[in-house]
């Protein structure tokens, strides 16, 4: 079995303020078991945007039905985008454990926000 890869196909995405941004992410294997998390930024100061395992993320919805068998699509939609949402978003696979541990990250998708036309 090939080792899991995290694929973020879009290097960048541009969205108008007030609209929703779709950030694409797929994984290439069901192994290892464990959740997906999305972060804005990298390093210790990165901001958690979505955690499949736990938490409340009212602006985030999953694009596919992530509970369904053999699902490998962990794309998300973030609603009501503002300029403060600009940054690079990383889709990160975690490995099940106590606690779950980071396994592999996607390359990132840079989100830029266009001003609303007047």
């Amino acid at each position: 079995e090939e080792e899991l890869q995290v694929i973020q196909p879009d290097k960048s995405v541009s969205v108008a303020a007030g609209e929703s941004a779709i950030l694409h992410c797929t994984v290439t294997s069901l192994i290892p078991v464990g959740p997906i998390q999305w972060f804005r930024g990298a390093g210790p100061a990165r901001e958690l945007i979505y955690n499949q395992k736990e938490g409340h993320f009212p602006r985030v919805t999953t694009v596919s039905e992530s509970t369904k068998r053999e699902n490998m699509d962990f794309s998300i939609s973030i609603s009501n985008i503002t300029p403060a949402d600009a940054g690079t978003y990383y889709c990160v696979k975690f490995r099940k454990g106590s606690p779950d541990t980071e396994f592999k990250s996607g390359a990132g998708t840079e989100l830029s926000v266009r001003g609303k036309p007047s």
Epitope: V33, Q52, K68
Partner: antibody
């Protein structure tokens, strides 16, 4: 950490119904399937059914299709398994178990609920 | 329906020796490039514990003396060096279709 806390032991008469609960914590309840499995005294494991709390999709073992009903209450992160028309051979420990990988497997288990059916 | 048959029904192995438990499926459990077989350990008075998923992948925290192998219809759980705490009943389960379990194998110390 993931925890599944099941309701207490039950004693029922033949022909009655029982409803076992399984309260989940430590994870987003709607993101993972819940399975129900039973084990008669001194016997092996028998899969009953599974439910996706996000949309209440269910799959049942044909043996239990007419007597078992799975439900969830997402407001309390609780899953329920009701078994009707109980017989003495339904005496068993009933387990709930969470499927962490959507593989139709059982990663985290409750401690079990003993249901005794006796006249 | 796919039926899983474990062998042997019971097994006695000396401490430090290898224990091997087999699970045969009545038809192939391979699909989408995966073998949909899982192994569980159950000690008396406890719920089962997942050991191996998708035939050969150790679950988190499972000692590396446990390994799973096989493909298609024939699968094996191996304990490379039996420890006292490994005394338990072991079950295989498939999810190629809706789940079913094997009948279990009781492992004891010789």
């Amino acid at each position: 950490q993931v925890q599944l806390v099941q309701s207490g032991a039950e004693v029922k008469k033949p022909g009655a119904s029982v409803k076992v609960s399984c309260k989940a914590s430590g994870y987003t309840f709607t993101n993972y399937w819940i399975n129900w499995v039973r084990q008669a005294p001194g016997q092996g494991l028998e899969w009953i059914a599974m439910i996706d709390p996000s949309d209440s999709e269910t799959h049942y073992n044909q043996i239990f299709k007419d007597r078992a009903t799975l439900t969830t209450d997402t407001s309390t992160s609780t899953a329920y398994m009701e078994l009707r028309s109980l017989r003495s051979d339904d005496t068993a420990v009933y387990y709930c178990a969470m499927d962490y990988g959507s593989l139709y497997a059982m990663d985290y288990w409750g401690r079990g609920t003993l249901v005794t059916v006796s006249s | 329906d796919i039926v899983l048959t474990q062998s042997p029904d019971s097994l006695a192995v000396s401490l430090g020796e290898r224990a091997t438990i087999n699970c045969r499926a009545s038809q192939s459990v391979r699909s989408s490039g995966y073998n949909w077989i899982f192994w569980y350990q159950q000690k008396p008075g406890q719920p089962p514990k997942l050991l191996i998923y998708l035939a050969s992948n150790r679950d988190s925290g499972v000692p590396d003396r446990f390994s799973g192998s096989g493909s298609g219809t024939d699968f094996t759980l191996t304990i490379s060096s039996l420890q006292a705490e490994d005394v338990a009943v072991y079950y295989c389960q498939h999810s190629r279709e809706l789940p079913t379990f094997g009948q279990g194998t009781k492992l004891e110390i010789k």
